[in-house]
């Protein structure tokens, strides 16, 4: 069975084809080759000499036991080599020779017992080394690591490392890898020698499910003293053994580290006193809790010095009391409990993401809700009922506003967005908004993107509601049940580049409403019920138009519409997916491609 | 279509068939077997995925006695610092994991419950596997 040609001459997918040897019938120019799940078993010298241009080579689960010297010789352009799941028993010293451009080496679950005799010291270009799920017992980074000056990611998770000694990291003292991210999760650690990490700088350190008791966790974290880390991730996994006990003593040792960003990811334990618990983390710039349960929600009003707070997928008794002077970014998403939003006091806040919480807002939105006048980004998408009772007074700095898939009330009772002259992006898609007031978008003089799909209009008619949106470049009006539009609805949108009118209910096509859209490049009218043109003679669309989508409509392919069908053929160079433009009537032409029709009409009057 | 038996409990019998062409082997054990009236136990899965599990989610299509429920999407792996350790599993890496579950207080009517589980992962998104579970429910007190 032949390989699948994904991109001609470039990418070939040969997965699970029962190959015992490397195929020789693929082009020399192949750059991406997936040979995974084939019983190759043995890689001899110059195994891939037929593919000198290879950049990505996937050999996952190929039952490879032996890799000889120079197996990859000639692959000087290879940047990614994947060896996951091969039971390697014999790895020659020169197994990886010739890989002068290799940036990513994945040797997950390959029976690797030690880094010491892993022959990769010459791979100077290596950026990512993943040796997770192996049998490595020692964390000693071999001397050859001093050659790997570009290394940015080292994944040692799911190995057998129990202890870390001062000598293990000596090579990092000689040659500090300032950008190194290190993942040691799922190693059964019980000892970190104090001073082992002294004066070590890491970009990121991840330690999840490493400790089988609170005491071990406590002493190991104390053993990290002196480490300077940009981002520290601690925590557990839901499907692994979890700590039976967790209290403030666990994290006391963090006072002896220099941490820029901290994240606690999953803890099967109720956090009650977060002030004491995170006492050593009051001055990190970014603080993040993922998948934890928080009992006392008042604690977030303590004077933490955080600039970014992230609470994701957590459980709360009620919406937390948030009073944080220095906070600039708050991400509070996919949380449970506390369904009603309560006011927060965050005077420095610029970015607020409150999406996917099922929250309801009794009154939205003004400065008093968020305790700030600096807000530039506000995401309230995928929530519950949001009642618009104020038009963003004090929030005039807003540039990005997202309400999609929340239930907006009172949207047509006043000019909700009147204050937002700096707003660039607005998404009110699928918000149950019924447009019954022409001033709905008044004030949005800087708006560039407006998404309002899945809403409705009074009498299914689009009126002149966009008159002030002179900078608009993207407008989505899909799924709005529209049947008619004002001929002047788009007259002020001279900058508009993309207009989506798909999935509405137009019976006819008219070019007239688009005559002023001098910048229009994409017009999507797919999934309507267009049968013919509104007027017998259709004018041209703006000359800027590059893509016109008329697929999945109800074209009436009869003589009386000959001029419209001819006009469609004349637009052929603009049309996308022409094979999905089919006749709906009459019954003998149903399903025929419109462009293949040859309608010759006898005008017998 | 070959049917794979999972387990029997006092009020349910659970089996599955593949609903994709590939039928890559997957081993599923539930201990103790699920009782629909109330259940607590461990789900053990052994599987070698044909693509990375990053951003794994399930589409669930549930049928209750021929009545179709709306499609549900259950996100398992968001993509970074996920709850489950198998979210970091790579294509070709052995996934051998035990997940605890519990639910209570749901009353099910007697009959045949079908659940099509479409597992989708990776970027670009592609189907990982598709299993159709059949649960025959015989409530012993209803």
């Amino acid at each position: 069975e032949p390989c699948v040609e994904v991109v001609p001459n470039i990418t070939y997918q040969c997965m699970e084809l029962n190959f015992y040897k490397i195929p020789d019938n693929l082009p020399f120019s192949t750059k991406n080759l997936d040979l995974s799940f084939n019983p190759l078993r043995h890689l001899g010298s110059y195994s891939f000499f037929s593919f000198p241009e290879l950049q990505v080579l996937d050999l996952s689960r190929c039952e490879i036991q032996t890799i000889e010297d120079g197996a990859y010789q000639s692959l000087s352009h290879l940047s990614t080599l994947i060896l996951t799941g091969n039971p390697i028993q014999s790895l020659a010293l020169g197994a990886f020779s010739g890989l002068s451009s290799l940036q990513k080496l994945v040797a997950v679950e390959t029976n690797l017992a030690s880094l010491e005799n892993f022959p990769i010291g010459h791979l100077k270009t290596l950026k990512e080394l993943n040796v997770a799920h192996n049998l490595i017992q020692s964390f000693k980074l071999p001397e050859y690591f001093s050659n790997l000056t570009n290394l940015e990611h080292l994944d040692l998770s799911s190995n057998k490392i129990q202890s870390i000694y001062c000598t293990d990291l000596r090579v990092l003292h000689q040659m500090p890898l300032l950008n190194l991210s290190l993942d040691l999760s799922l190693n059964p650690m019980n000892f970190i020698q104090p001073g082992a990490f002294k004066e070590i700088r890491l970009h990121k350190l991840t330690l999840r499910n490493n400790f089988d008791s609170l005491n071990v966790m406590k002493t190991c974290i104390q053993g990290l003293a002196g480490l300077e880390v940009h981002r520290l991730v601690l925590g557990e996994f839901r499907n692994e053994g979890n700590l039976e006990k967790f209290d403030k003593s666990a994290l006391e040792g963090l006072c002896n580290l220099t941490i820029e960003e901290f994240r606690l990811a999953y803890l099967d334990y109720y956090l009650d006193d977060i002030i004491d618990l995170f006492n050593c983390l009051t001055n990190v710039s970014s603080f993040s809790l993922v998948s934890v349960t928080i009992e006392r929600v008042k604690d977030f009003s303590y004077n933490f010095g955080w600039q970014h707070l992230e609470l994701v997928n957590c459980k709360f008794g009620q919406f937390p009391t948030l009073k944080l002077k220095s906070l600039k970014r708050l991400t509070f998403t996919s949380n449970k409990g506390g369904n009603a939003f309560s006011e927060v006091d965050l005077p420095s806040l610029e970015f607020l993401d409150l999406s996917r919480n099922g929250l309801s807002f009794k009154g939205c939105c003004s400065q008093s809700d968020f305790g700030t006048t600096s807000l530039k980004y506000l995401d309230l998408s995928f929530n519950g009922v949001i009642t618009m009772s104020s038009n963003f007074l004090g929030l005039e700095q807003l540039e990005h506003l997202d309400f999609q898939h929340s239930n907006l009330k009172q949207m047509s009772e006043f000019s909700v967005f009147l204050s937002l002259r700096n707003l660039i992006y607005l998404d009110i898609s699928h918000t149950h908004t019924r447009v019954a007031f022409n001033g709905i978008f008044n004030g949005l003089s800087s708006l560039e993107v407006l998404k309002m799909a899945g809403n409705s209009f009074q009498e299914n008619f689009l009126p002149d509601i966009f008159t002030e949106l002179r900078n608009l470049t993207f407008l989505d009006l899909s799924q709005c049940q529209l049947e008619q539009l004002s001929p002047t609805a788009f007259n002020s949108l001279s900058s508009l580049q993309v207009l989506n009118m798909s999935h509405n209910n137009f019976f006819s096509l008219d070019t007239f409403p688009y005559k002023c859209l001098n910048s229009l490049q994409v017009l999507d009218y797919s999934l309507n019920h267009i049968m013919t043109s509104k007027k017998q003679e259709l004018q041209h669309f703006p000359s800027s138009l590059a893509f016109l989508n008329l697929t999945q409509n109800d074209f009436a392919c009869t003589c009386e519409h000959q001029s419209f069908l001819q006009w469609i053929k004349d637009q052929r160079q603009l049309l996308v997916e022409v094979e999905r433009m089919e006749c709906a009537t009459p019954s003998d032409k149903q399903g025929m491609p419109v462009l293949s029709l040859n309608i010759t009409c006898q005008m017998n009057k | 279509q070959k049917q794979y038996w999972v387990c029997n409990s006092s009020d349910a019998s659970i089996s599955y068939t593949y609903c994709d062409k590939m039928q890559y082997p997957i081993s599923i054990n539930v201990n103790p077997c699920i009782e629909l009236k109330r259940s607590k136990g461990l789900l053990h899965i052994f599987y070698i995925p044909r693509r990375d599990l990053k951003q794994l989610y399930f589409n669930l299509y549930i049928t209750v006695n021929t009545m179709n429920l709306p499609k549900r999407k259950e996100v398992i792996c968001r993509g970074s610092d996920d709850d489950y350790s198998f979210c970091r599993a790579l294509k070709g890496e052995t996934v051998n994991t035990t997940i605890s579950f519990s639910f209570k207080g749901i009353k099910f009517s007697k009959g045949k419950y079908k659940c099509v589980v479409e597992a989708i992962s990776g970027s670009p998104e592609e189907m990982l596997f598709c299993l159709e579970f059949v649960i025959l429910h015989q409530p012993n007190s209803n």
């Epitope: 009498e459 049940q481 049947e483 008619q484 209910n505 019920h529 109800d554 709906a584 | -």
Partner: nanobody
Framework: EVQLVESGGGLVQAGGSLRLSCVAS????????MGWFRQAPGKERDIVAR????????YYSESVKGRFTISRDNAKNTVYLQMNSLRPEDTAVYYC????????????WGQGTQVTVSS
């Protein structure tokens, strides 16, 4: 399941009028397009008229423009076709059609009602 039942057909002299009715049952169709097709002996079935949910948009085939009027009463789940100035070439079986609530065109069909125009 949606059922469409037409009525009002019959024999009429050229120049006369008829009013066809179509009642939908099984679910409300107030949010979908409805219309009328016809099929004359030996000819293909083709659309005559169509009306949008709010009645804002209507479509008529060229041959009936100015003579036929489509209308609907959403409260009664009914669509009508008023046919004036009938001609012998209007003789056909007239079918009521409705789109699906999901937006698929011409999803539901009635059994048809015979209209015969004699000269």
């Amino acid at each position: 399941e949606v059922q469409l039942v037409e009525s009002g057909g019959g024999l009429v002299q050229a120049g006369g009028s008829l009013r066809l009715s179509c009642v939908a049952s099984g679910r409300t169709l107030s949010t979908v397009n409805m219309g009328w097709f016809r099929q004359a002996p030996g000819k293909e079935r083709d659309i005559v008229a169509r009306i949008s949910p709010s009645s804002v948009s209507t479509y008529y085939s060229e041959s009936v423009k100015g003579r036929f009027t489509i209308s609907r009463d959403n409260a009664k789940n009914t669509v009508y076709l008023q046919m004036n100035s009938l001609r012998p070439e209007d003789t056909a079986v007239y079918y009521c059609v409705a789109d699906s609530p999901g937006g698929r065109s011409y999803e539901y069909w009635g059994q048809g009602t015979q209209v015969t125009v004699s000269s």
